[in-house]
Interface confidence: low
């Protein structure tokens, strides 16, 4: 190889060892039979050399630095050449460095031809191995503007006082042009301006100077976004830190065309603007930091550009002003991540503050809109607490558990509406009365409605799930001892049409000791399946539940258990079941941890089934499934 650098070219070439690989045989640069591991060639020098191995690219890297002095003479503006040409260089990983020094009053602009640049964060690398590292200068301090790959949106970077651009090319890359030009501009009066151009839908992730380290103190950095007028842009902060300010406040400022309040000033912790039409600027302003404990200011953010959706022009009013202790969250439904670009899906408050999820609280009227390509990507979860603190005031009081119509009118599917029902301990209990009798969901008779009620204890230490219930069954009411949560969960968009079938009333009633009592009024010729709470996990220790089963005068009920033994093994106490005729009070008692479960039995009158658990050994839980079937009494039961 021969490298000859013209006099006055201000170019230095350095060949040095890269990160050594685990290769057995070392490699050297050979000049006049001398073996060396580093070679420096300066302007005006001509050197002939070879390598002592077949694959020098595994050992060495080459750096070509050109110093451009715009302080003492005219600046060579225009397209930047790769000098020496890559064809004259050995095939090593190579880095071309241009170090431009200029006066503070001169602005320098790097213009990148297509493909434009894409900024990458720490630990990221470029797919083709070609990276652009750009830094600026504040007095004598070097400031890293960022590291960039090809195929992005960054078209221009403006700086003043000097710029250092390093283009890294892997040894195998055929590129033979720099891909950028330098132009002079008037002073930009800030650290830098980065221009990002969107031709269509897409996203860009950008970072403050020096990221992930601290942004220079009291500096200003601007990003200019060029967005077609028919598209919408949204900004979201992925990561930020605030430093400790002594004077002034760290902030971001937006210049949004058409806004009457330019510049719009936001704190970094604020929700950032969304749904912006056309071009806009974003500036990051630092502060004077505390000398003793400066901390660091840093910011990583994403700009998402997409088509406006029909919904983005519609405003929905969610009136929660008359509600208490209620929160409504609109959020993305869980999906498998796809690798291709997926347009963002945002919900916007007052059309401007957009984010992927939004929580609205009671006591106010909220105006929301959507910036989303497909609203089925979102769902709603609502929580409402109904609590009674004074048992004398609440007793016999009733509340309707109904989804407010304002919520049903939103164009987003309701997933869960949870009511947390709280009562004073050992003072009151609760009764749930549905508008339509309920069916308990079982494997044998699953619910196939568009929604169900999930009833569970709301006492933190108690793991008790009563079950999932849907309209169209035989359960007339459910009484529970203490705090519960009732969740209306929807399973199909058709819930909107079936919403009229929902309706549950809760009443506060005098306290009773049993964990739950189900009142069952079976319909003729239908088999009612019932199962103990906490199915699959077992009825909790020392818990008692009952079923009050009505048998009409002209009917007989057949009670059937679906296994021979309960399977429970008690560590302490006894598990038992009582079947009691309500008219005669006659009862049968079965020891569930010892006896065989009863064979199918026939009941001519209403009866109770009560199941009480012991403290079972782990793995030997109490789970019972039984059914009740009515048949006319005229049938010969023998």
């Amino acid at each position: 190889f021969e490298i000859a650098l013209p006099r006055e070219s201000n170019i230095t070439v350095l060949i040095k060892l890269g990160t050594p690989t685990l290769l057995a045989k070392p490699c050297y640069i050979v000049i006049s039979k001398r073996h060396i591991t580093m070679l420096s060639i300066k302007s005006g020098e001509r050197i002939v050399f070879t390598f002592s191995c077949q694959s020098p690219e595994n050992h060495f890297v080459i750096e070509i630095q050109k110093n451009i002095d715009c302080m003492s003479g005219p600046c060579p503006f225009g397209e930047v050449q790769l000098q020496p040409s890559t064809s004259l260089l050995p095939t090593l990983n190579r880095t071309f460095i241009w170090d431009v020094k200029a006066h503070k009053s001169i602005g320098l602009e790097l213009q990148f031809s297509i493909p434009r640049l894409r900024q990458i964060g720490p630990g990221e690398s470029c797919p083709d191995g070609v990276t652009h590292s750009i830094s600026g200068r504040i007095d004598a301090t070097v400031v890293r503007i960022g590291t960039f790959c090809s195929n992005g949106t960054v078209s221009r970077i403006k700086m003043q006082e000097g710029v250092k651009m390093a283009l890294h090319l892997p040894w195998f890359h055929p590129r033979n042009v720099s891909g950028f030009s330098i132009a002079n501009r008037s002073s930009i009066k800030r650290l830098c301006i980065i221009e990002s151009v969107f031709e269509g839908e897409g996203s860009a992730t950008l970072m403050s100077a020096n990221y992930p380290e601290g942004f220079p103190e009291d500096e200003l950095m601007t990003w200019q976004f060029v967005v077609p007028a028919h598209l919408r842009a949204s900004v979201s902060f992925l990561n930020f830190n605030l430093s400790n300010c002594e004077r002034k406040e760290e902030r971001v400022e937006y210049y949004i065309p058409g806004s009457t309040t330019n510049p719009e000033v936001f704190k970094l912790e604020d929700k950032q603007p969304g749904n912006m039409a056309g071009n806009f600027n974003l500036s990051l302003q630092g502060c004077d930091q505390d000398a003793q404990s400066p901390g660091i200011l840093r910011l990583q953010f994403q700009v998402l550009v997409q088509h406006p959706q029909n919904e983005s022009n519609k405003i929905y009013v969610v009136d929660l002003s008359n509600e208490r202790a209620m929160s409504l969250t609109i959020e993305p439904r869980p999906v498998k991540q796809s690798r291709k670009f997926v347009p963002g899906c945002f919900v916007c408050l007052e059309s401007r503050t957009c984010s992927s999820n939004l929580t609205l609280t009671s006591g106010s009227k909220h105006k929301i809109s959507f910036l989303c390509d497909d609203l089925t990507r979102l769902w709603m979860n609502v929580e409402k607490t109904i609590s009674c603190t004074d048992h004398r005031y609440c007793q016999r009081k009733s509340y309707s558990l109904q989804v407010p119509s304002d919520i049903l009118h939103l164009p987003v599917e309701l997933h869960d509406f949870s009511w947390k029902l709280l009562v004073p301990k050992d003072r009151l209990s609760l009764v749930l009365v549905p508008a339509q009798k309920l069916q308990q969901h079982t494997h044998e008779k699953p619910c196939n409605t568009s929604f169900s009620y999930l009833v569970a204890s709301a006492i933190p230490s108690q793991d008790l799930y009563f079950g999932s219930f849907c309209p169209g069954g035989s359960i007339k009411q459910i009484q529970v001892k203490q705090n519960i949560s009732v969740t209306l969960r929807t399973f199909a968009p058709s819930f909107q049409q079936e919403a009229s079938r929902q309706g549950l009333t809760v009443s506060f009633i005098p306290y009773f000791k049993e964990e739950g009592v189900f009142t069952v009024t079976p319909d003729t010729k239908s088999k009612v399946y019932l199962r103990t709470p906490n199915w699959d996990r077992g009825l909790p220790s020392l818990t008692s539940v009952s079923w009050n089963i009505s048998v009409p005068r002209d009917q007989v009920a057949c009670l059937t258990f679906f296994k021979e033994r309960s399977g429970v093994v008690c560590q302490t106490g006894r598990a038992f079941m009582i079947i009691q005729e309500q008219r005669t009070r006659a009862e049968e008692i079965f020891s569930l941890d010892e006896d065989v479960l009863p064979k199918p039995s026939f009941h001519h009158h209403s009866f109770w089934v009560n199941i009480s658990n012991c403290s079972p050994t782990s793995g030997k839980q109490l789970d019972l499934l039984f059914s009740v079937t009515l048949t006319p009494r005229t049938v010969d039961l023998t």
């Epitope: 990160t19 630990g123 992930p212 380290e213 990561n239 830190n241 660091i296």
Partner: antibody
Framework: EVQLVESGGGLVQPGGSLRLSCAAS????????MHWVRQAPGKGLEWVAS????????SYADSVKGRFTISADTSKNTAYLQMNSLRAEDTAVYYC?????????WGQGTLVTVSS | DIQMTQSPSSLSASVGDRVTITCRAS??????VAWYQQKPGKAPKLLIY???SLYSGVPSRFSGSRSGTDFTLTISSLQPEDFATYYC??????????FGQGTKVEIK
């Protein structure tokens, strides 16, 4: 296979120095944050220092700032913790860990005892 | 600095129990919270990262969730090998990284 092996621990007097090493294999430390985390006997985990060698980025817990120095030799694929002016409260098992989203690989730890 | 307040500091449970450990961040840390398991004399092991992502090779009985600045680690059905100390950690800020005080899960 990713592996981290710490060494250099031992008994040292208050005011003394030690240098811990963390030899990494199965990955390139340049592409990851490397951390030192310590655990005093019977106590919880305490972050000590971090390095991101690609950008020469280092950071330290307040309790060790000015006394400990984290460094990395990417050619040896090894991270180091130079500990000076050691105090009794620095007695702990010192773990080295790498992270991306979180600390996914840890070494087995090396015990540092500071006692007179 | 961000504090991670972990509770409870210890708990007794039986095999098969559902166990919940919570961590509250003193300020927003987005979803940058990880959970680790540590057994006596051993290095910690990563269970959950980014608040709810299960690390490869970790049994699915472990799960993580986030509600604002509250983070929860749940073991749906405690197994004999799960008796250990659990730590949460925020990685939102590279400096300083902070761990919770730890929760020791003991056999009842």
């Amino acid at each position: 296979e990713v592996q981290l092996v710490e060494s250099g621990g031992g008994l040292v007097q208050p005011g003394g120095s030690l240098r811990l090493s963390c030899a990494a294999s199965g990955f390139n430390i340049s592409y990851y944050y490397m951390h030192w985390v310590r655990q005093a006997p019977g106590k919880g985990l305490e972050w000590v220092a971090s390095i991101y060698s690609s950008s020469s980025y280092t950071s330290y817990a307040d309790s060790v700032k000015g006394r400990f120095t984290i460094s990395a030799d990417t050619s040896k694929n090894t991270a180091y913790l130079q500990m000076n002016s050691l105090r009794a409260e620095d007695t702990a098992v010192y773990y080295c860990a790498r992270s991306y989203y979180a600390m996914d690989y840890w070494g087995q730890g090396t015990l540092v005892t500071v006692s007179s | 600095d961000i504090q991670m307040t972990q509770s409870p500091s210890s708990l007794s449970a039986s095999v098969g129990d559902r166990v919940t450990i919570t961590c509250r961040a003193s300020q927003s840390v987005s979803s940058a919270v990880a959970w680790y398991q540590q057994k006596p004399g051993k290095a910690p092991k990563l269970l959950i990262y980014s608040a709810s992502s299960l690390y490869s090779g970790v049994p699915s009985r472990f799960s993580g969730s986030r509600s604002g600045t509250d983070f929860t680690l749940t073991i749906s059905s405690l197994q004999p090998e799960d008796f250990a100390t659990y730590y949460c950690q925020q990685s939102y800020y590279v400096y300083p990284i902070t761990f919770g005080q730890g929760t020791k899960v003991e056999i009842k």
